[in-house]
């Protein structure tokens, strides 16, 4: 399954929306910076598109969940958030279409399950951090920047896989 060209355009639009969503200067949040331990190696481990698609799907689903909460709605501009949901939803649809076409419908390799679990734990760490910081504007700014970075890293891996095949 070849993801449509619109998928990578969608990834870029997602990053542009995340950039636009920014509401405060990081300068006031330096003490809140945090290493969430993005499991980059879990994306690097997937040598076939069939293996990486479910992991990328999990990543985007978790981003969707994170920004769909009541606390998130209070933190961000509603119009931008709606556009952001639409972009993520479209990307999830693209990835699901690939799975339906037979990519990854065979028995899920254990390695892939481990990778999906690692992504879930990464988002659990982010959620816990937000909770501990009482969903402060600075905590959300740190998380917004982290999601930009990790989303970019995961989609870049997808692009490099596509160019290899």
């Amino acid at each position: 399954c070849d993801l449509p060209q619109t998928h990578s355009l969608g990834s870029r639009r997602t990053l542009m929306l995340l950039a636009q969503m920014r509401r405060i200067s990081l300068f006031s949040c330096l003490k809140d910076r945090h290493d969430f331990g993005f499991p980059q190696e879990e994306f690097g481990n997937q040598f076939q598109k069939a293996e990486t698609i479910p992991v990328l799907h999990e990543m985007i689903q978790q981003i969707f969940n994170l920004f769909s909460t009541k606390d998130s709605s209070a933190a961000w501009d509603e119009t931008l958030l709606d556009k952001f949901y639409t972009e993520l939803y479209q990307q999830l649809n693209d990835l699901e279409a690939c799975v339906i076409q037979g990519v990854g419908v065979t028995e899920t390799p254990l390695m892939k399950e481990d990778s999906i679990l690692a992504v879930r734990k990464y988002f659990q760490r982010i959620t816990l951090y937000l909770k501990e910081k009482k969903y402060s504007p600075c905590a959300w700014e740190v998380v917004r920047a982290e999601i930009m970075r990790s989303f970019s890293l995961s989609t870049n891996l997808q692009e490099s896989l596509r160019s290899k095949e």
Epitope: L15, A19, I24, S25, L26, R33, A145, R149, S152
Partner: antibody, heavy 114, light 109 residues
Framework: QVQLVQSGAEMKKPGSSVKVSCKDF????????VNWVRQAPGQGLEWMGG????????NYAQKFQGRITITADESTSTAYMELSSLRFDDTAIYYC???????WGQGTLVTVSS | EMVLTQSPATLSLSPGERATLSCRAS??????LAWYQQKPGQVPRLLVY???SRANGTPARFSGGGSGTDFTLTISSLELEDFAVYYC???????????FGGGTRVEIK
Amino acid sequence: QVQLVQSGAEMKKPGSSVKVSCKDFGGTFSVYGVNWVRQAPGQGLEWMGGLIPVIGPANYAQKFQGRITITADESTSTAYMELSSLRFDDTAIYYCVRDDNEYWGQGTLVTVSS
Amino acid sequence: EMVLTQSPATLSLSPGERATLSCRASQTVSTFLAWYQQKPGQVPRLLVYDISSRANGTPARFSGGGSGTDFTLTISSLELEDFAVYYCQWRSNWPPSLTFGGGTRVEIK
């Protein structure tokens, strides 16, 4: 603490090009914009262009469109600004500025002289 | 395109006096308005960011304010080291860009 360190002063001839580098020692280089600003002798601050490395491509001020190129190497957290077809009035101090106002490079003096 | 107009171009005052610098935007500005101080031969120094937040090391006599299109930097009581050029600056999140005002020179009367 974020620190931006720029390459050294340059002396250039009219019509040539200059490439200034800016290394970011610390922080989230890839997700915050890097802007380039210049200041001619006795003049104010002038924005030239900016780039958010994870998104790209760069956004340029109309005045410099066509002769400026801003790039970034995420692996080394280094941004570059190349200005071509240099003129005498391009003599200025060139600064890289992290998207978060407070972080400025030390400045690079580019002198255009025949 | 955003334009920032600073006034006055030059402000002549004595130490101990109050200085009010103005910055007018051509369109409504969101959070990211900052003020810089620059002395001859030095890199601009951030004083105030996000309209009214003082940067680390900025003395309490400096305060930023305003909303919409009109912003001010106030120096409550000028000290000798405050005589310099001040710039207001606005930042766009996307596409990334910076807009600077023309500057206000605060000189000793």
